[in-house]
């Protein structure tokens, strides 16, 4: 059931273009995200029994449509790898080893949080240009699989309790929660 | 498909806080951008704040900042609006709004079905 | 803070056509405002009809369209049905913060 379904019919991979680097580290210079406004980091591997999972992450880099209109650049997509188990044990090639017991948990590499990104797509016949926000996958986490393996039945590692709303890490520059911004004038 | 069912009608009197939920199904309320609009009587619509995903932080409109509060409980899939110093004109229908949870961006495409606040001494 | 100004009320004849505007008060609505557009009747939650200036809903019905007209986001409801009297409200999106429009009131008549 997620908008992962969608992402086919929204991305092409460009041809002759590797996986980027890793982004750069974020500064270490950190906000109070509770009085920011910003959904804390999710830290999936913070009980003590966990803390040795890893989860694979992959970059692509792609172009995205919509109907007729292709975006003027190419966008960077995260990609959760399926597996994911002990750090010590996950092979380079990801899915050689089967970690886990026979009949231990599954667990699975799912997105965690996602992150929004501006797309100016071009669209053919002199047809006006669209604006659109993209749905990116900004960090994947391990969950354990019920025997249902659906997507709601993925359970969290560890307990999560009420929080601020939303804030993954905040991006460097990334505003907190914070007045209304529609008081300046408008930058575009 | 999203679908959002809010907590039931409220009388405060001035000064008191109101905390407003919005119970999340259909996806979990980590894919989403939770929004809340308020309506009063007779009146149009007012953006109070929400979560901007391009920054990956709740944004307050300035009108409310200091009064407002929005949290969420990923256990339960519920998203929360508290307002405090209540006054009279706080009076309405407070409604969460959701995206569709698709690949692109579109937000308030799914609304819960509001929760009338009425504060009154 | 921005202003977002709509017309308070337009009446339109049973299968006329009447376009809704919707301007800022900080200049020029373009593409990057990501224009949005909501119908809402009497004791109704809001509905989306437009999001991104002219991207439709499933449940948006074929006669209403968003365009850019003249530096304000535009809505054309072509061939108006008695079902479409309602009050019109746009949205824009100022970085993240959004501000509604005052409304238009339309009537079909």
């Known amino acids: 059931q997620g908008w992962q379904a969608f992402r086919n019919d929204a991305t092409e991979v460009i041809p002759g273009l590797g996986e980027y680097p890793e982004p750069p580290p974020e500064n270490n210079q950190t906000m109070n995200r509770a009085e920011n406004g910003g959904r804390p980091p999710h830290h999936p591997y913070d009980a003590k029994d966990v803390s040795e999972y890893s989860c694979r992450e992959l970059h692509y880099t792609r172009f995205l449509t919509d109907g007729p209109c292709r975006s003027a650049k190419p966008v960077t997509e995260l990609v959760c790898s399926g597996q994911c188990g002990p750090a010590r044990l996950l092979p380079n090639a990801i899915g050689r080893v089967k970690w886990w017991r026979p009949n231990g948990p599954d667990f699975r590499c799912i997105p965690d949080r996602y992150r929004a990104q501006r797309v100016q797509l071009l669209c053919p016949g002199g047809a006006a240009p669209r604006s659109r926000k993209v749905r990116l996958v900004a960090s994947c986490k391990c969950k354990r699989l019920t025997r249902f393996h659906n997507q709601s039945e993925l359970k969290d590692f560890g307990p999560e309790t009420a929080r601020p709303q939303k804030g993954r890490k905040p991006r460097p520059g990334a505003r907190g929660a914070k007045a209304n911004q529609a008081e300046l004038e408008n930058a575009y | 498909e999203v679908q959002l069912v809010q907590s039931g009608a409220e009388v405060k009197k001035p000064g008191a806080s109101v905390k407003v939920s919005c119970k999340v199904s259909g996806y979990t309320l980590s894919e989403l951008s939770i929004h809340w609009v308020r309506q009063a009587p007779g009146k149009g619509l007012e953006w109070m704040g929400g979560f901007d995903p391009e920054d990956g932080e709740t944004i307050y409109a300035q009108k409310f900042q200091g009064r407002v509060t929005m949290t969420e409980d990923t256990s339960t899939d519920t998203a929360y609006m508290e307002l405090s110093s209540l006054r009279s004109e706080d009076t309405a229908v407070y409604y969460c709004a959701t995206d569709s949870a698709g690949y692109w961006y579109k937000f308030f495409q799914h609304w819960g079905q509001g929760t009338l606040v009425t504060v009154s001494s | 803070q921005a202003v977002v100004t709509q017309e308070p009320s337009l009446t339109v004849s049973p299968g006329g056509t009447v376009t809704l505007t919707c301007g800022s008060s900080?200049?020029?609505?373009?593409?990057?405002?990501?224009p949005y557009w909501f119908q809402q009747k009497p004791g109704q939650a809001p509905r989306t009809l437009i999001s991104d200036t002219d991207d439709k809903h499933s449940w948006t019905p074929a006669r209403f369209s968003g365009s850019l007209l003249g530096g304000k986001a535009a809505l054309t409801l072509s061939g108006a049905q008695p079902e479409d009297e309602a009050e019109y409200y746009c949205l824009l999106d100022y970085g993240g913060s959004f501000v509604f429009g005052g409304g238009t009131k339309l009537t079909v008549l």
């Open positions: 900080t200049g020029a609505v373009t593409i990057d405002h990501y």
